[in-house]
């Protein structure tokens, strides 16, 4: 069962799945000036059996100008250089995501893919949040969200995370004045927020996201 919507938006935070449950779909989208190859799939799908999960299909982009040339799916060195790593303190040991039964790992990038990935998650998927560079986390509880099915409808649990600018410090996290409520923030105010993916996973995260490095964002 696919989740009706995307995980909640938290101001100045990004979210990331550490592994993708079977049934997850990833849009095959290309950056401007490129398009999917003719008869190329619109989606990659995480599928598998009891022992192994993998993405069916490969996303492929070709130049909009050149009608019949197929671009390779391996990223070029200069494309990889475009990505910037943001580290948080105390990195943990990486985990092999393939060891999670019924889950797929992050698909490798494909050449000329769009600047952000659009995933369609399934019920039971968990995503983890962290503050973007320049903001720090104030925790009221777990910085994670799970897609749950209740009364025949899907919903995401609300992550208990507030991201505050590093300049705004107070002695106790409890005294910190939140910048905005996690809910009800207008779409127009979230331009700094890059949700779902564009990340290469470097570590497993602690459930509360206290200690991890995990983002490698497109700029």
């Amino acid at each position: 069962e696919l989740c009706d919507d995307d995980p909640p938006e938290i101001p100045h935070a990004t979210f990331k799945a550490m592994a993708y449950k079977e049934g997850t779909m990833l849009n095959c989208e290309c950056k401007r000036g490129f398009r999917r190859i003719k008869s190329g799939s619109l989606y990659m799908l995480c599928t598998g059996n009891s022992s192994h999960s993998s993405w069916d299909n490969q996303c492929q982009c070709t130049s909009s100008a050149t009608r019949n040339t197929t671009k390779q799916v391996t990223p070029q060195p200069e494309e990889q250089k475009e990505r910037k790593t943001t580290e948080m303190q105390s990195p943990m040991q990486p985990v092999d995501q393939a060891s999670l039964p019924g889950h797929c790992r992050e698909p490798p990038p494909w050449e000329n893919e769009a600047t952000e990935r659009i995933y369609h998650f399934v019920v039971g998927q968990m995503v983890y949040y962290q503050c973007v560079q320049g903001y720090r986390a104030l925790h009221r509880g777990p910085a994670e969200s799970v897609c749950k099915m209740t009364h025949g409808k899907t919903r995401w649990t609300q992550p208990q995370l507030i991201c505050t600018g590093e300049m705004e410090t107070s002695q106790f996290p409890g005294e910190e004045k939140p910048q905005a409520s996690p809910e009800g923030r207008p779409e127009s105010e979230t331009s700094c927020l890059v949700t779902t993916t564009d990340f290469q996973i470097q570590t497993e995260m602690a459930a509360t996201m206290e200690t991890s490095i995990f983002t490698t964002e497109y700029q």
């Epitope: 849009n27 989208e29 401007r32 799939s41 989606y43 799908l45 069916d56 659009i118």
Partner: antibody, heavy 115, light 107 residues
Framework: QVQLVQSGAEVKKPGSSVKVSCKAS????????INWVRQAPGQGLEWMGR????????NYAQKFQGRVTITADKSTSTAYMELSSLRSEDTAVYYC????????WGQGTLVTVSS | EIVLTQSPGTLSLSPGERATLSCRAS??????LAWYQQKPGQAPRLLIY???SRATGIPDRFSGSGSGTDFTLTISRLEPEDFAVYYC?????????FGGGTKVEIK
Amino acid sequence: QVQLVQSGAEVKKPGSSVKVSCKASGGTFSRYIINWVRQAPGQGLEWMGRIIPILGVENYAQKFQGRVTITADKSTSTAYMELSSLRSEDTAVYYCARKDWFDYWGQGTLVTVSS
Amino acid sequence: EIVLTQSPGTLSLSPGERATLSCRASQSVSSYLAWYQQKPGQAPRLLIYGASSRATGIPDRFSGSGSGTDFTLTISRLEPEDFAVYYCQQYGSSPLTFGGGTKVEIK
């Protein structure tokens, strides 16, 4: 709850253009996939194209390429479909719909092309 | 483009009967197939996506099956409100395409 609300009916002259709007509420508009589908009187459904606002990526059906433009305004959570060089056979109900499996639909906008 | 052929064009049945609608794709669409119900003057309503997953709020008398090129929508026991036109649609590759529709009418 997601809702897609479309602009009202239009009567246009052949050769002119029409711009239909689709305002979304609920969910994260910028990450929506907004599709446009039309239905001529008594006919079936026909896909015209789509946009993903956060990516600024549009795709169009070959039949409408060059004649249709799909745009999105993230600040107002509104998608637009503009069809130019109208002819009588473009008389149809135009729908916007979310995702590629069209889980939510607008109520439809009747565009009548008549001289 | 992928052509979807629906059959039969019209299905005449009585309330309480079972309806079986078919949709055949000109090439494989994997499980990227959806079914819609449309009543006169209304927008279509999503019934099934992913070939077999029921959309939110859809009664369990509606079920979908199949993968690849052959798909079926089954309405186990027709209710009076089920008489409508049904469309299949593929979203495996661009352009997205629809079948021509099957009208389920009261016999």
